[in-house]
């Protein structure tokens, strides 16, 4: 570091003074020198090191007409916003000829009210749930003692006696405010006031009570909500998407869920207008005057299969001698599940109804044995799923086949081991 020499008399006629103050202070240090001839550049040192980027000014005033006469040089150093790193010993430095000269030192010190490095933050917590708050302050002067306050009431008898940097709160049953006071020899600084909002706890034990093809009944156990009664609970249902999938506890679903509000109590809700035989995910959160609890994890549920809601369509039944041809189309109405097959019912005017399971085929050829003289034959068809049979079609009379009518090649239905045809057996 540059070091002044005393071989010649110092040119400095004014030395930097002292500044002590709080963070953020704007201060100016000055030095003044009188030199003969060309005025030198004035440099500033802090703790013996040149300040390369010093915010300094320099004024040069000639004391005579000639450039070789004496000059007064004034240099000012600006400290725009005093920080701890600015504290130290300051000197002016000039190079004159082959010598350097330094002024007498001035001192910059930081001393004021405590300064917060960390303050308590607003947050939400579930009722009766432990949490921590942080507060940190520094001087100088040190030491800095902290005093926590809850709803403006000190939590200790004196600064430094209670918890310091971290305050552990075992739980709250009402929304409260917290702040901390920092005390040092200069006085007291109060932190911002953090509002800790008490929300209901996350509901527990979300489960299915009953299942119908288009509705699910669910129930849950509410969490504690402190002094604030629950106003309602909100249930969200989401079609399960195999592509995306809903992770357990994922905060937001990938698409807009169906959202329903439930009055409480009871902590139960019927979800209607659902798709049968469809996987869903559901979750629930409850609300008090203070806000919404956290959501439960997504619970996978599934609506059961239902029976088809309509009969098969476009049933056609024709008879040609000893054969009957019946064909139909899948019901237009929702199947409410996986179609397992069709049942066909056949009945004559004075004969009992006979049921057949056709499987998944949509046409059948019936081999009528005997003279086929049974009168007023009618056919009904119903679709079925694992949940049961859907509604039967209206009876379709078996019409005689007329030449010119198309006659498709049909699957014969005939049990070879069955006895010879004798109504009502096929």
């Amino acid at each position: 570091a540059p070091r002044g020499t005393q071989a010649e008399e110092s040119p400095f006629v004014g030395n930097p003074g002292n500044i002590t103050g709080a963070r953020g202070l704007t201060g100016t240090l000055r030095c003044q020198l009188q030199v003969q001839g060309e005025p030198p550049e004035v440099h500033w040192l802090r703790d013996g090191q040149i300040l390369e980027l010093a915010d300094s000014t320099q004024t040069q005033v000639p004391l005579g007409e000639d450039e070789q006469d004496d000059w007064i040089v004034v240099s000012q150093l600006r400290i725009a916003s005093l920080q701890l790193s600015d504290a130290g010993q300051y000197q002016c430095l000039v190079f004159l000829g082959h010598q350097n000269f330094v002024s007498q030192p001035g001192y910059v010190g930081l001393e004021g009210l405590p300064y917060f490095l960390e303050e308590p933050e607003d947050r939400t917590v579930a009722a009766n749930t432990p949490f921590n708050l942080s507060c940190q302050a520094q001087g100088p002067p040190e030491p800095v003692d902290l005093l926590w306050l809850q709803d403006a009431v000190p939590l200790a008898t004196a600064p430094g006696h209670g918890p310091q940097r971290n305050l552990h709160v075992p739980g709250l049953n009402k929304t409260s405010s917290f702040s901390c006071e920092a005390h040092n020899a200069k006085g007291v600084t109060t932190s911002r006031t953090a509002t800790i909002t008490v929300l209901p706890q996350q509901p527990r034990n979300l489960h299915l009570v009953s299942r119908q093809p288009t509705e699910l009944e669910v129930a849950w156990t509410p969490g504690l909500s402190g002094i604030y009664p629950l106003t309602h609970c909100t249930l969200q249902a989401m079609l399960s998407d195999n592509e995306v999938g809903i992770q357990a506890g994922e905060p937001d679903p990938p698409e807009e869920p169906l959202t329903l509000q439930a009055s409480v109590p009871p902590h139960q809700l019927r979800l209607g207008s659902l798709h049968p035989h469809t996987p869903y995910h559901i979750r629930v959160a409850c609300t008090s005057s203070q806000g919404l609890s956290s959501w439960t994890h997504w619970l996978p549920v599934e609506t059961p299969e239902g029976v088809p809601l309509g009969p098969p369509e476009n049933i056609s039944a024709t008879r040609n001698g000893s054969q009957a041809f019946v064909h139909w189309q899948e019901p237009r109405a929702p199947l409410q599940g996986t179609l397992l097959g069709y049942r066909l019912a056949y009945q004559g005017q004075d004969t009992p109804e006979v049921l057949m399971d056709i499987g998944l085929r949509q046409e059948v050829t019936l081999e009528l044995q005997g003279d086929g003289s049974v009168s007023n034959l009618t056919v009904c068809v119903a679709a079925y799923t694992a949940a049961g049979d859907g509604p039967w079609s209206l009876p379709v009379p078996l019409e005689a086949w007329r030449p010119g009518q198309a006659q498709p090649v049909h699957q014969l239905v005939k049990e070879t081991s069955a006895p010879a045809f004798s109504w009502p057996w096929w």
Epitope: G17, T28, Q32, T57, Q58
Partner: antibody, heavy 125, light 107 residues
Framework: EVQLVESGGGLVQPGGSLRLSCAAS????????IHWVRQAPGKGLEWVGW????????YYADSVKGRFTISADTSKNTAYLQMNSLRAEDTAVYYC??????????????????WGQGTLVTVSS | DIQMTQSPSSLSASVGDRVTITCRAS??????VAWYQQKPGKAPKLLIY???FLYSGVPSRFSGSGSGTDFTLTISSLQPEDFATYYC?????????FGQGTKVEIK
């Protein structure tokens, strides 16, 4: 005699730009900090920013940061205020002022001892 | 930013009256306070710096006092040329801030 003279004010549309000059005489710009202060019609004084002409360092009020730039040319003994992205709320008389901070070895704070006559900037469509 | 609150915002006084204007800082500003006088259509003029130091050329009827957060400008005997608006300004921290002004009018 110490004197500061502003120029460059006028009418400008919102979003427009204007450059104000502050010509100093009777003292060297290098020896002090130069401040810009504005005063909206019928209102009080508002600090805009300062420059150290010797080093070129400048500080700004939050309300103008990123839009205004203060510079200086010590050879011309003149400071400048470049105003971009002007808004209606920038309408004011703009003053430049020299900082006075005494002659002791140190001081806390400062005052402004010489002010220009002011130049009116009107931002309106 | 530090707020500077001046009171009163205006006052009426007669020539020869003693006038006191106060300025309160929102936090400690030591003695880094200046006072200015401004007349309509003119630039402000420095009266007092460092809370209590009279700027050169300013009549001695003007005086300033205070430290910390409370500051006072006093005109011991109001003269006709003193009817103007007066501003306090703190420069303890950046940005420097001004009071809203006190208008001194003729009663």
């Amino acid at each position: 005699e110490v004197q500061l003279v502003e120029s460059g004010g006028g009418l400008v549309q919102p979003g427009g730009s204007l450059r104000l000059s502050c010509a100093a005489s009777g003292f060297s710009l290098s020896g002090s900090w130069i401040h810009w202060v504005r005063q909206a019609p019928g209102k009080g004084l508002e600090w805009v920013g300062w420059i150290n002409p010797y080093r070129g360092y400048a500080y700004y009020a939050d309300s103008v940061k990123g839009r205004f730039t203060i510079s200086a040319d010590t050879s011309k003994n003149t400071a400048y205020l470049q105003m971009n992205s002007l808004r209606a709320e920038d309408t004011a008389v703009y003053y430049c002022a020299r900082e006075y901070s005494g002659w002791g070895g140190s001081s806390v704070g400062y005052a402004m001892d010489y002010w220009g006559q002011g130049t009116l900037v009107t931002v309106s469509s | 930013d530090i707020q500077m609150t001046q009171s009163p915002s205006s006052l009426s006084a007669s020539v020869g009256d003693r006038v006191t204007i106060t300025c309160r800082a929102s936090q400690d500003v030591s003695t880094a306070v200046a006072w200015y006088q401004q007349k309509p259509g003119k630039a402000p003029k420095l009266l007092i710096y460092s809370a209590s130091f009279l700027y050169s050329g300013v009549p001695s009827r003007f005086s300033g006092s205070g430290s910390g957060t409370d500051f006072t400008l006093t005109i011991s005997s109001l003269q006709p040329e003193d009817f103007a608006t007066y501003y306090c300004q703190q420069s303890y921290t950046t940005p420097p801030t001004f009071g809203q002004g006190t208008k001194v009018e003729i009663k």
